[in-house]
């Protein structure tokens, strides 16, 4: 889906004027942006020698990190470049400017509606984690209709910047644990679950920790059934696969539907050299088709002794009387030699990639 870039994400190679001394500037950049921090001399007087520091450690200039007396540039920024930056007088170590920089996915995912605390105070002083917006964490019980999007937030800070992890009912919680997957927005200290279903009910705990301590907060989610609803497929399944000629492959598709879904495995085919019919509908052949009586179905497609003919685009499709959910995926089939060559080519390619 196209979500668009949110205005608060600072544009590529945008220069940001420095704050008044003693103030902390909170800045958000998009992944891949050029971070430019500017620290003019206080009162316009002479600057003297300066050093740029990130999270208490002096920055070493490199091809990507360009250090000047009044300006710092970090090219092709990534999440690792988030942190507390300061420009200091070399001799006195007096802080002339300091910035809290957070590098987020860009364009923004669109699920961070409020956004004001996207760049939290990471704190210049060393210290254990603490909540930066405790007033936003008062609502411990969340009851939402099924099919809605739920977002739990635990905005925190500390130095070094703490890590955040999530538990469901006291156990580690990962994307593969739920139909529809999850989105972890570490920069927003949030857990996002789209299209929630009754099985998402439970206690969700955020654990925020660094080497100086750990804090946690538990939310309870109740899902009010919005039924019937169209089928939901688990995010990331089925996954694309590459197989060697003659091998066996297996694809998984997890379907959630409270109304008996018709589940199909389909393969795109060509008819008379065309992939689509006169009306523009793709030609497909049905490989497997059945009706599931269970609310959650973990369905598999197994292809034995694959040949080059098996390569191509496939679909897992679930249909009930409300609507359809489908996921396309690819199978690439190579001879053993071709597979080896592909590994060599990938190795030689180094950092070159296709978008």
């Amino acid at each position: 889906e196209s979500l668009g870039t949110e205005q608060r994400v600072v544009g590529r190679a945008a220069e940001v004027p420095g704050p008044e001394p003693g103030q902390q500037e909170q800045l958000v950049f998009g992944s891949g942006d050029a971070v430019e921090l500017s620290c003019p001399p206080p009162g316009g007087g002479p600057m003297g020698p300066t050093v740029w520091v990130k999270d208490g450690t002096g920055l070493v200039p490199s091809e990507r990190v360009l250090v000047g007396p009044q300006r710092l540039q970090v090219l092709n920024a990534s999440h690792e470049d988030s942190g507390a930056y300061s420009c200091r007088q070399r001799l006195t170590q007096r802080v002339l400017c300091h910035f809290s920089v957070r590098v987020t996915d860009a364009p923004s995912s669109g699920d961070d509606e409020d956004g004001e605390d996207e760049a939290e105070d990471t704190g210049v002083d060393t210290g254990a984690p603490y909540w930066t917006r405790p007033e936003r964490m008062d609502k411990k019980l969340l009851a939402v209709p099924a099919a809605n999007t739920v977002r739990f937030r635990c905005p925190a800070a500390g130095n070094p910047t703490p890590s955040i992890s999530w538990l469901k009912n006291g156990r580690e919680f990962r994307g593969e644990h739920r139909i529809g997957g999850i989105k972890l927005r570490h920069q927003q200290w949030s857990l996002v679950m789209e299209s929630v279903v009754p099985s998402d009910r439970g206690n969700y705990t955020c654990v925020v920790e660094n080497k100086f301590g750990s804090i946690r907060q538990t939310y309870t989610l109740d899902v009010l059934e919005r039924s019937p609803h169209r089928p939901i497929l688990q995010a990331g399944l089925p996954a694309n696969q590459t197989a060697v000629l003659g091998s066996d492959v297996e694809f998984h598709c997890k379907v959630y539907s409270d109304a008996q879904p018709h589940i199909q495995w389909l393969k795109h085919v060509e008819v008379n050299g065309s992939k689509v019919g006169p009306d523009g509908t793709p030609y497909v052949t049905v490989l497997k088709s059945w009706i599931s009586e269970s609310v959650e179905a973990d369905v598999r497609l197994r292809l034995a002794n694959v040949s080059e003919r098996d390569g191509g685009e496939y679909l897992c499709r679930a249909t009930n009387f409300i609507g359809v959910a489908e996921k396309a995926f690819w199978l690439s089939v190579h001879g053993p030699r071709a597979a080896e060559e592909e590994l060599v080519e990938a190795d030689e390619a180094g950092s070159v990639y296709a978008g």
């Epitope: 019937p228 169209r230 109304a259 008996q260 009706i291 009387f321 409300i322 609507g323 359809v324």
Partner: antibody, heavy 115, light 108 residues
Framework: QVQLQESGPGLVKPSETLSLTCTVS????????WSWIRQLPGKELEWIGH???????RYNPSLQSRVTISIDTSKNQFSLKLSSVTAADTAVYYC?????????WGQGTLVTVSS | EIVLTQSPGTLSLSPGERATLSCRTS???????LAWYQQKPGQAPRLLIY???RRATGIPDRFSGSGSGTDFTLTISRLEPEDFVVYYC?????????FGQGTKLEIK
């Protein structure tokens, strides 16, 4: 909350074509089935047909030769055309979400076939 | 096409009583593809039950559906004054999807 609203003329002359449009609000029309159902004066409910957001359709065989259902995803609308109408087509016409069983209905619009 | 026969045509009961509405199909319905709707005067029908026994959102638990094959039942455990309206069953397992003629629930 999904809402559906039928619109179109309430009076159609015999042998002409009945045309109704349903506007969907509160959700995208994509990935769902959308149906037309009518309720005849004797209160009998009759399924007319449905359309999927891709444009694929299924019609009641008893009406198939006269029915066309189309969809405009950019406007979040779908439409019904019923040709060569007679007095027997006088009914309250409902648009609804779902292919067969339906969970959301419009409030219905009465279409009278009369000269 | 599959014909649905609802019985009785009219059912007279008092508030607080239990109502049992029947729907019989001319052919077996695959996978319990049967729905029940409630229709109040001047309103569109409202989905109560789908899949023969699954309650739709917001439907009070006094409504329950059961049955399989050709015999299906809608049960209202304790009748409230607002329940005295018309009920339709519908099969959606085989096109054309067809409705019963309705059962009118009236206050005795």
């Amino acid at each position: 909350q999904v809402q559906l609203q039928e619109s179109g003329p309430g009076l159609v002359k015999p042998s002409e074509t009945l045309s109704l449009t349903c506007t969907v609000s509160g959700d995208s029309i994509n990935s769902y089935f959308w149906s037309w159902i009518r309720q005849l004066p004797g209160k009998e409910l009759e399924w007319i047909g449905h359309i999927y957001s891709s444009g694929s359709t299924r019609y009641n065989p008893s009406l198939q030769s006269r029915v066309t259902i189309s969809i405009d995803t950019s406007k979040n609308q779908f439409s019904l055309k019923l040709s060569s109408v007679t007095a027997a087509d006088t009914a309250v016409y409902y648009c609804a979400r779902g292919a067969s069983a339906v969970d959301y209905w419009g409030q219905g619009t009465l279409v009278t076939v009369s000269s | 096409e599959i014909v649905l026969t609802q019985s009785p045509g009219t059912l007279s009961l008092s508030p607080g009583e239990r109502a049992t509405l029947s729907c019989r199909t001319s052919q077996s319905i695959s996978s319990g593809y049967l729905a029940w709707y409630q229709q109040k005067p001047g309103q569109a029908p409202r989905l109560l039950i789908y899949g023969a026994s699954r309650r739709a959102t917001g439907i009070p638990d006094r409504f329950s559906g059961s049955g399989s094959g050709t015999d299906f039942t809608l049960t209202i455990s304790r009748l409230e004054p607002e329940d005295f309206v018309v009920y339709y069953c519908q099969q959606y397992g085989s096109s054309p999807y067809t409705f019963g003629q309705g059962t009118k629930l009236e206050i005795k």
